[in-house]
């Protein structure tokens, strides 16, 4: 029998590298049967995850996946660390695994490093 | 709908850098994860890694200290480069969109030979 | 890294028989297994994803079965065009595949 569960595809321990100024984009894709669930995003601020209010979101699609977009118009500094997505299904919450934005702000950069540069210079990053 | 290419020499010599683009047509590679696949002759796949839609990386442990994985958006194209290589990286190179839940579109696969 | 494990390695069969064959993963990774297949010269084909569920265009009598640590894909009744080798793939941080499994004639 063919799974109908909501899925929230955010690949455990993944992160983006990005600038700050930058426009960004990060995708939440979602799998579901017959209704799309109410999806969010929050941002954690240590164990807990504080949902994200007035944001600019939208929703794609492609083949069997729906993707719910968390808009960045553009970086700021203060958008750097780790994000969460949440399903609303059925009464119950599905939540996505973390994902990390290390955001580099261009001001204390000469010239923006390369992403294997970033990995390597964790001085980068905000903490 | 996507389509993948792979292209690159089909000859490399040892301790050489392999370097292999994947050019993807009818989609952007601003979406999605993009992968490496490899298919040493007679045996089985091994996973490379991957580039993220953000350019973030992720490496096969095995591999990582030979491999880089880059992206030209503005080309739409995917690189892979494998440095230091043996015989033993002698393989067919396949690229592959990785569609969160698996690798749902594949390239033809191209043949690398690291000989002298 | 995760290990998966495939049974058998090969095995013969007839058209129109059932084919199972089994992937064992070395650790939980719920349902985040997909199943392809491949024929000779050719690049592996997306069959399964999520353990269960079948991937546009795949025929029907491809289904696939198990989370945790263990799962099946099944061919209900084999066809000419089936004949081919069959890979699981886990697809966690560390993305792997099994070893492959070669359906043969019988």
């Known amino acids: 029998k063919e799974s109908c569960d909501v899925q929230l595809y955010i690949k455990r321990q993944s992160y983006h590298s990005i600038f700050a100024g930058d426009p960004f984009k990060l995708e939440c894709p979602v799998k579901y049967c017959a209704h799309r669930p109410q999806v969010t995003w929050c941002k954690l601020n240590g164990t807990t995850c504080v949902k994200l209010e007035g944001r600019h979101t939208s929703w794609k699609q492609e083949k069997n996946l729906s993707f719910f977009i968390l808009h960045f118009e553009p970086v700021l500094p203060s958008d750097n660390g780790s994000y969460r997505c949440s399903a609303n299904f059925l009464s119950a919450i599905i939540e996505s695994h973390s994902t990390t934005l290390y955001v580099t702000d261009v001001k204390s950069a000469s010239e923006r490093p390369s992403k294997d540069e970033m990995a390597s210079r964790p001085w980068l990053l905000y903490s | 709908q996507v389509q993948l290419q792979e292209s690159g020499p089909g000859l490399v010599k040892p301790s050489e850098t392999l370097s292999l683009t994947c050019t993807v047509s009818g989609g952007s590679i601003s979406s999605y994860y993009w992968s490496w696949i490899r298919q040493p002759p007679g045996k089985g796949l091994e996973w490379i890694g991957y580039i993220s839609y953000s350019g973030s990386t992720n490496y096969n442990p095995s591999l990582k200290s030979r491999v880089t994985i880059s992206a030209d958006t503005s080309k739409n194209q995917f690189s892979l480069k494998l440095s230091s290589v043996t015989a033993a990286d002698t393989a067919v190179y396949y690229c592959?969109?990785?569609?969160?839940?698996?690798?749902?579109?594949w390239g033809q696969g191209t043949t690398v030979t690291v000989s002298s | 890294a995760i290990q998966l494990t495939q049974s058998p390695s090969s095995l013969s069969a007839s058209v129109g028989d059932r084919v199972t064959i089994t992937c064992r993963a070395s650790q939980g990774i719920s349902s985040a297994l997909a199943w392809y297949q491949q024929k000779p010269g050719k690049a592996p084909k997306l069959l399964i994803y999520?353990?269960?569920s079948l991937e546009s265009g795949v025929p029907s009598r491809f289904s696939g079965s198990g989370s945790g640590t263990d799962f099946t894909l099944t061919i209900s009744s084999l066809q000419p065009e089936d004949f081919a080798t069959y890979y699981c793939h886990q697809f966690d941080y560390y993305p792997t595949f099994g070893g492959g499994t070669k359906v043969e004639i019988k």
């Open positions: 999520d353990a269960s």
């Open positions: 592959a969109r990785d569609f969160y839940y698996g690798m749902d579109v």
